[in-house]
């Protein structure tokens, strides 16, 4: 376990409580909210992070057109149910017994129903499109430099295997990062694209989940890359099931 040995903290998740009570007096960290032990050498799952957040005191050079089945997280924050591995349970319900089905990144993919609603399986989000607009700069970023820095960021900060960053598109001032990861491609120990995207989203908002004081410092050939808008689209292996009423609203 790689929580810092002396002051016993979790480098990859500040929303933890750590103490030297692991085997051999090693540092062990547990996520706030759920109390689940977390592996501080990798990203914590989005489900456990959302749960911790809810428990915390409140204070081609062409751009991709998201498919008709792409989901955007319009519902915002909720206190999720996580399984023993820290993944989202397929069915989520609130305190008033309103239930809905979610995908592997916790985004609602059905209409809301009651306790009789069935969600047979957790549907995997296999394609994530991160759409960014950067603040004005003296000139456009060099596309290959931008591509290299964003790939490096996902590989080194978010520990995502390089093969899962499918593409980086750029048409000033819009940047799009495509992450793709099928169930069959994801090996044991691989970071999930949904978790990487969530860490990135929080970093971009200046709400870093890492222990560090510094936050994300993203630069392209020394020029700071500052993001003013972020939209994230989620594509599931099975299209979502919404009523026509919602689709025409």
């Amino acid at each position: 376990h790689t929580a810092a040995q002396d002051n016993c903290t979790c480098p990859t998740n500040k929303m933890t409580v750590c103490s030297p009570d692991g085997p051999g007096g090693r540092c062990q960290c547990r996520a706030l909210g759920s109390g689940m032990a977390v592996d501080c050498s990798t990203l914590t799952s989005k489900c456990l992070l959302l749960k911790a957040r809810m428990s915390a005191p409140k204070n081609a050079r062409t751009l991709v057109r998201p498919s008709e089945h792409a989901l955007v997280d319009n519902d915002g924050l909720y206190d999720p149910d996580c399984d023993p591995e820290g993944r989202f349970k397929a069915r989520q319900c609130n305190q008033t017994s309103v239930c809905w089905c979610v995908n592997s990144v916790g985004v609602r993919r059905t209409d809301k129903g009651d306790l009789s609603l069935r969600c047979d399986e957790l549907v995997r989000t296999h394609h994530i499109l991160i759409d960014l607009r950067h603040r004005p700069t003296a000139g456009a970023f060099n596309h290959s430099d931008l591509d290299a820095e964003l790939r490096r960021l996902f590989r080194e900060r978010y520990r995502l295997h390089p093969k899962f960053v499918a593409a980086v598109h750029y048409e000033q001032p819009t940047i799009q990062i495509e992450l793709r990861q099928n169930t069959s491609q994801k090996a044991a120990g691989d970071v999930d694209i949904g978790d990487a995207a969530y860490y990135f989203e929080r970093d971009i908002k200046g709400e870093s989940l890492f222990q560090g004081r510094g936050g994300l410092d993203l630069r392209v050939r020394g020029e700071p890359l500052q993001v003013e808008r972020t939209l994230i689209y989620y594509l599931d292996e099975i299209p979502p099931k919404f009523s026509m009423k919602r689709l025409t609203a």
Partner: antibody
Framework: QVQLVESGGGVVQPGRSLRVSCAAS????????MHWVRQAPGKGLEWVAV????????DYVDSVKGRFTISRDNSKNTLYLQMNSLRGEDTAVYYC??????????????WGQGTLVTVSS | DIQMTQSPSSLSASVGDRVTITCRAS??????LAWYQQKPGKVPKLLIY???TLQSGVPSRFSGSGSGTDFTLTISSLQPEDVATYYC?????????FGGGTKVEIK
């Protein structure tokens, strides 16, 4: 060009202290985790310590814990290794190396030329 | 702590031969493995990271494979300039342990 230059090595008696430095240039030092690696004469590579890009996290190999301290000054683009209570087995060439981008743990893509530390009475 | 075991510790091969070096982690480390080359009297040089990604500027005769606990470095056609000691290293988390090294010589 991207460069790391170590300094401060030398001969020191057992039980004494020494501080080695590593000056970085050609890249944005404050965005990279940094490491110290050592190599005893005729032996293999041994990782010694890491400090994250923002100084928020440090880790050490068991054999130096409590004796060595890694630190950095991002305003000076410099990495340090303070070595106290030195022992004969600490004799080695000490390399600084660049690690992860906005992180700590990653492969080392840039190495310094090394500085020799000899612990002997 | 996770141990990294390299084999063989040394080998001798002819120019043009295919050379394979293996590295085994005592526990799974996903793809967080690097390979380095150190020529006599020189500084180590990164060859491969993330188990199989070739570092920029490294000749394509070098390749890496594996995931989890078993990893391989292959030199498809050994050249005289490849005489060196090769090290694997895990970098999933601290300690970032190196393997013991494999010394490659020309017959």
């Amino acid at each position: 060009q991207v460069q790391l230059v170590e300094s401060g090595g030398g001969v020191v008696q057992p039980g004494r202290s020494l501080r080695v430095s590593c000056a970085a240039s050609g890249f944005i030092f404050s965005t990279y985790g940094m490491h110290w690696v050592r190599q005893a004469p005729g032996k293999g590579l041994e990782w010694v310590a890491v400090i994250w890009y923002d100084g928020s996290n440090e880790d050490y190999v068991d054999s130096v814990k409590g004796r060595f301290t890694i630190s950095r000054d991002n305003s000076k683009n410099t990495l340090y290794l303070q070595m106290n209570s030195l022992r004969g087995e600490d004799t080695a060439v000490y390399y600084c190396a660049r690690g992860g981008y906005n992180s700590g743990w990653w492969a080392f893509d840039v190495w310094g030329q090394g500085t020799l530390v000899t612990v002997s009475s | 702590d996770i141990q990294m075991t390299q084999s063989p510790s040394s080998l001798s091969a002819s120019v043009g031969d295919r050379v394979t070096i293996t590295c085994r982690a005592s526990q799974g480390i996903s793809h967080f493995l690097a390979w380095y080359q150190q020529k006599p009297g020189k500084v180590p040089k990164l060859l491969i990271y993330a188990a199989s990604t070739l570092q920029s500027g490294v000749p394509s005769r070098f390749s890496g494979s594996g995931s989890g606990t078993d990893f391989t470095l292959t030199i498809s056609s050994l050249q005289p300039e490849d005489v060196a000691t090769y090290y694997c290293q895990k970098f999933n988390s601290a300690p970032l342990t190196f393997g013991g090294g494999t010394k490659v010589e020309i017959k």
